[in-house]
């Protein structure tokens, strides 16, 4: 279990840089994470909203705090979800 956990961790950390990329090839991954964020009310993979770099300005719905029951914080003048998605993704992968 610890080995597979390590692999998932490494993969997610490596893929964090894709969120701030601006190429067409990274778009699909970014869109998948946006959908995941909306479903699980989380933000980014490792460092929260900062993972998105300059893309944060281009996707208006990114990480937006829509649920006052969940922990939120201010980032670039916007209320965003405080929790990163890494634990949710690991749980999701473990269940599926």
């Amino acid at each position: 279990k610890s080995k597979s956990d390590r692999i998932v961790n490494e993969t997610l950390y490596e893929n964090t840089k894709l969120l701030s990329a601006t190429g067409e090839s990274e778009k699909q991954f970014q869109e998948a994470i946006i959908v995941f964020q909306e479903e699980f009310k989380c933000c980014g993979l490792v460092n929260g909203a900062a993972d998105w770099g300059n893309n944060f300005q281009h996707y208006p719905e990114l990480c937006a705090c829509l649920d006052k029951q969940r922990p939120c914080q201010s980032y670039n003048g916007k209320q965003v979800y405080k929790e990163t998605c890494i634990s949710f993704i690991k749980d999701f992968l473990a269940k599926n």
């Epitope: 869109e31 959908v35 208006p60 937006a64 705090c65 829509l66 916007k78």
Partner: antibody, heavy 116, light 109 residues
Framework: EVQLLESGGGLVQPGGSLRLSCAAS????????MSWVRQAPGKGLEWVSA????????YYADSVKGRFTISRDNSKNTLYLQMNSLRAEDTAVYYC?????????WGQGTLVTVSS | QSVLTQPPSASGTPGQRVTISCSGS????????VYWYQQLPGTAPKLLIY???QRPSGVPDRFSGSKSGTSASLAISGLRSEDEADYYC???????????FGGGTKLTV
């Protein structure tokens, strides 16, 4: 080209029910949150409800909470709004919109009239 | 009574510049993006400005948005007759857990 086509509107008596549908095309429906916004005759816009891409999260305006239910069928590229216990003040054109932050594409709307 | 406050009407002559204001609070405009929508007579609304000041492709640069604190504004320069429409501001309100609109501003050219 993004297209949203609402249907299901009509005349209904107070206390009655109606189900609106919105057929979407021209984009990957399952990737987007979807919303309903309404506009009473001669009045401004009022947000009604929104649903996340996979239906985990649903949001409602206080004015419709407990009476309206938003849902979607990603296999059919269709958004729904089940409206129960309808009131005269629910009379409006109901628009289906893609996303919610912001509503970037809108349908042409379907008119719901609640009257006895 | 709308959560966001807009003037009910505004007017200008062709070529002029007009500004429409939108006032809110810290639970909406102050901590969330502002969006502007244009509704031409008898048609569905159309997105004009997102993320306070960004224009979707196809929207002329005569339209510009800005935000300061809990207020936002839409400026239209080089006014044209086809700009005659209703304009609405909108934002998510995290206290209400819902989307809120201004009451709309009817622009007459």
């Amino acid at each position: 080209e993004v297209q949203l086509l609402e249907s299901g509107g009509g005349l209904v008596q107070p206390g009655g029910s109606l189900r609106l549908s919105c057929a979407a095309s021209g984009f990957t429906f399952s990737n987007y949150a979807m919303s309903w916004v309404r506009q009473a005759p001669g009045k401004g816009l009022e947000w009604v409800s929104a649903i996340s891409p996979g239906s985990s999260n649903k949001y409602y305006a206080d004015s419709v909470k407990g009476r309206f239910t938003i849902s979607r069928d990603n296999s059919k590229n269709t958004l729904y709004l089940q409206m129960n216990s309808l009131r005269a003040e629910d009379t409006a054109v109901y628009y289906c919109a893609r996303k919610h932050l912001p509503f970037d594409y809108w349908g042409q709307g379907t008119l719901v009239t609640v009257s006895s | 009574q709308s959560v966001l406050t807009q003037p009910p009407s505004a007017s200008g002559t062709p070529g002029q510049r007009v500004t429409i204001s939108c006032s809110g609070s810290s639970s909406n405009i102050g901590n969330n993006d502002v969006y502007w929508y244009q509704q031409l007579p008898g048609t569905a609304p159309k997105l004009l400005i997102y993320s306070d000041s960004q224009r979707p492709s196809g929207v002329p640069d005569r339209f510009s948005g800005s935000k300061s604190g809990t207020s936002a504004s839409l400026a239209i320069s080089g006014l044209r007759s086809e700009d005659e429409a209703d304009y609405y501001c909108g934002s998510w309100d995290y206290s209400l857990s819902g989307y809120v609109f201004g009451g709309g501003t009817k622009l007459t050219v």
